[in-house]
Amino acid sequence: SGVFQLQLQEFINERGVLASGRPCEPGCRTFFRVCLKHFQAVVSPGPCTFGTVSTPVLGTNSFAVRDDSSGGGRNPLQLPFNFTWPGTFSLIIEAWHAPGDDLRPEALPPDALISKIAIQGSLAVGQNWLLDEQTSTLTRLRYSYRVICSDNYYGDNCSRLCKKRNDHFGHYVCQPDGNLSCLPGWTGEYCQQPICLSGCHEQNGYCSKPAECLCRPGWQGRLCNECIPHNGCRHGTCSTPWQCTCDEGWGGLFCDQDLNYCTHHSPCKNGATCSNSGQRSYTCTCRPGYTGVDCELELSECDSNPCRNGGSCKDQEDGYHCLCPPGYYGLHCEHSTLSCADSPCFNGGSCRERNQGANYACECPPNFTGSNCEKKVDRCTSNPCANGGQCLNRGPSRMCRCRPGFTGTYCELHVSDCARNPCAHGGTCHDLENGLMCTCPAGFSGRRCEVRTSIDACASSPCFNRATCYTDLSTDTFVCNCPYGFVGSRCEFPVGLP
């Protein structure tokens, strides 16, 4: 579909004569008839197969023709066609004299013809005008012509229909050949696919408009390349959506169980060695000179009673020093200058000569030790109590006093906080990580359900027959004050009145 356009520019008829040679009276009032048809080697009369058009009177004798697109499209003249342009044509232009106002062919005398020109040839579709001039004996016509495609038609022969669009069936304009030219940000055969944000994951991301990156379920991040782990996953990651692969030191479905308390919390102090012993459980091995569950307590070097034979220990910045009693010497007062004759054994210890009397040894009764039986046996020196338990000497034995929450001979067992039944008045106990919680029955409150809260025993309206109900706050019971004629704890029985 297109338009053959003919632009008349100048017509010269200086003598103002008709084709017959007869002059026009008073002058040749000239109009034109145009016939466009298929190519003919010799242009002959016959149907104007591509169309016809006529002009109004454009001037008298000789005149220039103004451009006039506004006045009904008079110049250039428009010959539209609804077919593929064949590339060739024949054109007949007739100049006629109009004696009156009726320009219809049947209203004109046959000799009103001024001139007739016929051309034929090839003509490609294009914007450029072809200028031509045809001269006869008495007239000259200057004109130009071209073929252009109608709106939305493209290609060498105006056969390709293309309408620019910007909706979800395409985002494009049309190229001169009728091919689509995608608007920025769009691609695909019909320019219907948006070009997503650069780097947007091909499978896990998509977009409905350019430079966007929308994530498919289970994916997140600006480029939709990060999987979403299982909901509630604490210390874990995923490689596919909804996974929860635990980080090192964590376990459980949600990776929220601490299997590496040592690393995550560093509970052991003073350079102690930490060993994981279960979920949220650990053991600290203290360096010499330290004690406590977390090795947080510094031991005096004298606490290990290094001085023997009754020597007294003095703490010093770089260690300790033993002050030996008479008859003893050495770093720990371990060497004796005494013999059995000096009765060196205390607390009923018996003395035995050694090395021909140059030395001696004491055999101590139970509960005493030391080279002179001078020390009571301390069964706590090995610090046998775990979890911060306090060691107590009890004659020949020892005993561990445990911290709250621990039990066992050596406080090695963790007891439930609820084991002591701490909740009063039938409260339900719940073990928590840092203590316990009591759920109290009706009428009680407080951390241990120890506080009695008054219950309105009358709330259930237990008294019948319009009796007045009173609450006994001391017992949380009710008392019914019966009206005349009723008895019973709820005033439920009528009394036979005289």
Partner: antibody, heavy 121, light 106 residues
């Protein structure tokens, strides 16, 4: 040959949600060459376009129905669905699902046989 | 909102040419489609992109679209062509149908 088949309840109570599914057979709903649309026709009246969806999940709705319409696609089942909330008697119509071809400028070259949905208490 | 207007009815004698118009603002700048719907049946696409026929549609169906008017032409109309005809176009991202024209073959 591609065929479309609507399914869903024929009776819906006012203020409830109308739900229909269109099952595509003989072709893939994941083709990049088509949008999948819903059109309705009240008894004795003309056609009204409701909305459509691309296999990626991009949706387009008639502005007059947008606040009440949801169209979704399930490529694994080769189905797409329509939900229309807060229905009234004016939503009584034959509901068609259709294939809209990009190569045909958006023309609907395949239609389901239609299902009548009546809104009544 | 964009509107497409069709005459409610058109009558034609068998063998004659029937023309059904569809008007809308600058419709010629959009692609028009035409659908045929017979009673109790689903619509059938007969013309797309103004003038193209899907396979299986007889040659007697043709279409044109320019200015504000699209036209469906049925040459040599047959009794079997009696049906409702709907034009359709896209306005931005919204599908718009004309009100429909009942073609009666006398």
């Amino acid at each position: 040959e591609v065929q479309l088949q609507e399914s869903g309840p024929g009776l819906v109570k006012p203020s409830e949600t109308l739900s229909l599914t269109c099952t595509v057979s003989g072709g893939s709903i994941s083709s990049s060459s088509y949008y999948w649309g819903w059109i309705r026709q009240p008894p004795g009246k003309g056609l009204e376009w409701i909305g459509d969806i691309y296999y990626t999940g991009s949706t387009y709705y008639n502005p007059s129905l947008k606040s009440r319409v949801t169209i979704s696609v399930d490529t694994s089942k080769n189905q797409f669905s329509l939900k229309l909330s807060s229905v009234t008697a004016a939503d009584t119509a034959v509901y068609y699902c259709a294939r809209q071809a990009l190569a045909m400028g958006g023309g609907s070259d395949k239609w389901g046989q239609g299902t009548l949905v009546t809104v009544s208490s | 909102s964009y509107e497409l207007t069709q005459p409610p009815s058109v009558s034609v004698s068998p063998g004659q040419t029937a023309s059904i118009t569809c008007s809308g603002q600058r419709l010629g700048d959009k692609y028009a489609s035409w659908y045929q719907q017979k009673p109790g049946q689903s619509p059938v696409l007969v013309i797309y992109e103004d003038s193209k026929r899907p396979s299986g549609i007889p040659e007697r169906f043709s279409g044109s679209n320019s200015g504000d008017t699209a036209t469906l032409t049925i040459s040599g109309t047959q009794p079997m062509d009696e049906a409702d005809y709907y034009c359709q176009a896209w306005d931005r991202d919204t599908g718009v149908f004309g009100g429909g024209t009942k073609l009666t073959v006398l």
